[in-house]
């Protein structure tokens, strides 16, 4: 058993049929020392009495709220929360499994510079009863500060007949150098707690590698006389590190038609400009990423031909 | 101001293709030997990240971009030595960080070319002959130290007269090659933004 | 003991809005981890679970009545209000009040509800 | 919404004998079910909370079992007091919906 927060406790136990489950004893938070008596949740019966409580807890009927009184005066209170693990590994029923990059993934985080400021976001099918705590630090050893603020609910979507729900956190590292080479990772831990069910997630992470440029801006043509061919030209973008000839970024412009099935056009460039042939009822897409380490590209930026 | 396309400084221009060269090849090793070593420990989640040139060397601080010189978090340990005279850097334009940016891109490129000689040395010595030094990138390396023309006494290539462990030197070679792309993206960074200044 | 009570107009009349007030003893929604569930039971019908509040404010509604209810506490009356909009003969039902505390999630005390017929 | 389906509408069981009664959820609701009982005329009384777990002052005889997406409630010998209709509800999601009955008589 460990303290969560004050007078919150988790309880670990292995969960399988018959299992004994795990001894606890509670101790009521009080000077006084006679006439105490235990509750669990808002039930009158008593459990127990004195300043001790020694429960037995196997399964979520054993957790809830314990509570000490006496005479008709509530003293302290004892959250007990519980901690499945099945076959030696931990319960993740809280969380999806997002499968990106690979299976197992429960938290996706993003950066759109190198300043240490990046997003984490997972998704759950449950809409209620639900809370989050995150914490993060820079290796884990001897921790250096990273600051995240509270999770919020930032989508609902519908999958089928089942609704998802996406919440998303944002932290900043305390003291960030943008040009820095890490050596050690980001760590994101997710406290997720439903109900009497806590669980907890984790994701290790270089900055570097969960870059993901925001799309480059002003994306503008302009058509080159007596020609089929367009000048596109457009701008880094706002959030991107500074200063741009040391943060350098590459890009790909694409020509698509209407239908899907069309070939695209695809040209790579480090300037941002390009001389593309635009096709009747084509549009004209860019796209960015890290022009020395190649992590996520944008999402793109377009302008139909017209 | 976005990517100037004023005409490169012609002493500083061939660093420029150089480091490009030398982060293609750093790169396409250490996906070669991702793929040939997939049953070690090689990619960036399974290695410690160790950095060979750390308290030698202090190309990040030295090749700060001016613009983050007032980020306090940057400015953790800036060296004040003083070697001059690379071929990469125009008269006019030499100052003193500058030099003493490029002289420790130079020493990165010393160490790690000594490293990676020796570890070569011992890879052709592995019955499997599982994996050995692209060399081109040892060439690259070469040539990037070249066009930075420092004068420094070279550093003997380390002998063992041990049988080697093949396991452990496998597993070198992926956190040297992890770090030295990490430098080199650096490298790269530098150059473009030396070139552009 | 925990007592719960319900209270509102026996009759509405279609388009009205109506109101229901549940009055509790026995709790308190000022400690933490205490809640109050609304529920409708239609005459011969299942239950229907229309929203919840919690001590906090925090609250949940049926998403397929939720343009139509509103929910809100008065902590020092020891109140509970739904409001519901736009009635229809269809919301002829017994409305419930339940408590919901954190920390058995269970609806453990009911009232014992109140009949609103809706007709013209 | 998740969607609970009780089954049978009806049951008729003798005195003394074990009455049966289940629900499935159209998706998985973890452990989170509750059990209720319902006599005529009075508001439903919670018998079973976290699929499993007998609340306070509820008479052994009642028992939950159930994960995931199928719950039984079991009396395992039918008193003449126990003459009601029982509904499943879960509270995994919201709406947090009831099954739609089950009515317990005595053969």
């Known amino acids: 058993i460990w303290e969560l927060k004050k007078d919150v406790y988790v309880v670990e136990l292995d969960w399988y049929p018959d299992a004994p489950g795990e001894m606890v004893v509670l101790t009521c938070d009080t000077p006084e020392e006679d006439g105490i008596t235990w509750t669990l949740d808002q039930s009158s019966e008593v459990l127990g009495s004195g300043k001790t409580l020694t429960i037995q807890v196997k399964e979520f009927g054993d957790a809830g709220q314990y509570t000490c009184h006496k005479g008709g005066e509530v003293l302290s209170h004892s959250l007990l929360l519980l901690h499945k693990k099945e076959d030696g590994i931990w319960s993740t029923d809280i969380l999806k499994d997002q499968k990106e990059p690979k299976n197992k993934t429960f938290l996706r985080c993003e950066a759109k510079n190198y300043s240490g400021r990046f997003t984490c976001w997972w998704l759950t099918t449950i809409s209620t009863d639900l809370t989050f705590s995150v914490k993060s630090s820079r290796g884990s050893s001897d921790p250096q500060g990273v600051t995240c603020g509270a999770a919020t609910l930032s989508a609902e979507r519908v999958r089928g007949d089942n609704k998802e729900y996406e919440y998303s956190v944002e932290c900043q590292e305390d003291s960030a150098c943008p040009a820095a080479e890490e050596s050690l990772p980001i760590e994101v831990m997710v406290d997720a707690v439903h109900k009497l069910k806590y669980e907890n997630y984790t994701s290790s992470f270089f900055i570097r590698d969960i870059i993901k440029p925001d799309p480059p801006k002003n994306l503008q043509l302009k058509p080159l006389k007596n020609s089929r061919q367009v000048e596109v030209s457009w701008e880094y973008p706002d959030t991107w590190s500074t200063p741009h000839s040391y943060f350098s970024l590459t890009f790909c412009v694409q020509v698509q038609g209407k239908s899907k099935r069309e070939k695209k056009d695809r040209v790579f460039t480090d300037k941002t400009s390009a001389t593309v042939i635009c096709r009747k009822n084509a549009s004209i897409s860019v796209r960015a990423q890290d022009r020395y380490y190649s992590s996520s590209w944008s999402e793109w930026a377009s302008v139909p031909c017209s | 101001r976005n990517l100037p396309v004023a005409t490169p400084d012609p002493g500083m221009f061939p660093c420029l293709h150089h480091s490009q060269n030398l982060l293609r090849a750093v790169s396409n090793m250490l996906q070669k030997a991702r793929q040939t070593l997939e049953f070690y420990p090689c990619t960036s989640e399974e290695i410690d990240h160790e950095d060979i040139t750390k308290d030698k060397t202090s190309t990040v601080e030295a090749c700060l971009p001016l613009e983050l010189t007032k980020n306090e978090s940057c400015l953790n340990s800036r060296e004040t030595s003083f070697i001059t005279n690379g071929s990469c850097l125009a008269s006019r334009k030499t100052s003193f960080m500058m030099a003493l940016c490029l002289s420790s891109i130079y020493e990165d490129l010393k160490m790690y070319q000594v490293e990676f000689k020796t570890m070569n040395a011992k890879l052709l010595m592995d019955p499997k002959r599982q994996i050995f030094l692209d060399q081109n990138m040892l060439a690259v390396i070469d040539e990037l130290m070249q066009a930075l023309n420092f004068n420094s006494e070279t550093v003997p290539q380390k002998s063992s007269l041990e049988e080697p462990d093949f396991y452990k030197t496998k597993i070198k070679l992926c956190i040297l090659l992890h770090a030295f792309r990490i430098r080199a993206v650096t490298i790269d960074r530098v150059m473009s933004y030396l070139n552009a200044s | 003991e925990v007592t719960l009570r319900e209270s509102g107009p026996a009759l509405v009349k279609p388009t009205q809005t109506l109101t229901l007030t549940c009055t509790f003893s026995?709790?308190?929604?000022?400690?933490?981890?205490?809640?109050v569930s609304w529920i409708r039971q239609p005459p011969g019908k299942a239950l229907e679970w229309l929203a919840h509040?919690?001590?906090?404010?925090?609250?949940y509604y049926n998403p397929s009545l939720k343009s139509r209810l509103t929910i809100s506490k008065d902590t020092s009356k020891n109140q509970v209000v739904l409001t519901m909009t736009n009635m229809d003969p269809v919301d002829t039902a017994t409305y419930y009040c339940?408590?919901?505390?954190?920390?058995?999630?269970?609806?453990?005390?009911w009232g014992q509800g109140t009949t609103v017929t809706v007709s013209s | 919404s998740v969607v609970m389906t009780q089954s049978p509408d009806s049951l008729a069981v003798s005195l003394g004998e074990r009455a049966t009664i289940n629900c499935k959820a159209s998706?998985?609701?973890?452990?989170?079910v509750a059990w209720f009982q319902q006599k005529p005329g009075q508001p439903p009384k919670l018998l079973i909370y976290?699929?499993?777990n007998r609340y306070t002052g509820v008479p052994d005889r009642f028992s939950g079992s159930g994960y995931g997406t199928d719950f039984t409630l079991t009396i395992s010998s039918l008193q003449a007091e126990d003459v009601a209709v029982y509904y499943c509800?879960?509270?995994?999601?919201?709406?947090?919906?009831f099954g739609g009955g089950t009515k317990v008589e005595i053969k």
């Open positions: 339940a408590r919901r505390t954190r920390v058995n999630y269970a609806m453990d005390y």
């Open positions: 026995g709790f308190s929604l000022s400690t933490s981890g205490m809640g």
């Open positions: 509040i919690w001590w906090d404010g925090d609250n």
């Open positions: 998706q998985s609701v973890s452990n989170d």
């Open positions: 976290y699929a499993s």
């Open positions: 509800q879960q509270d995994y999601n919201s709406p947090w919906t």
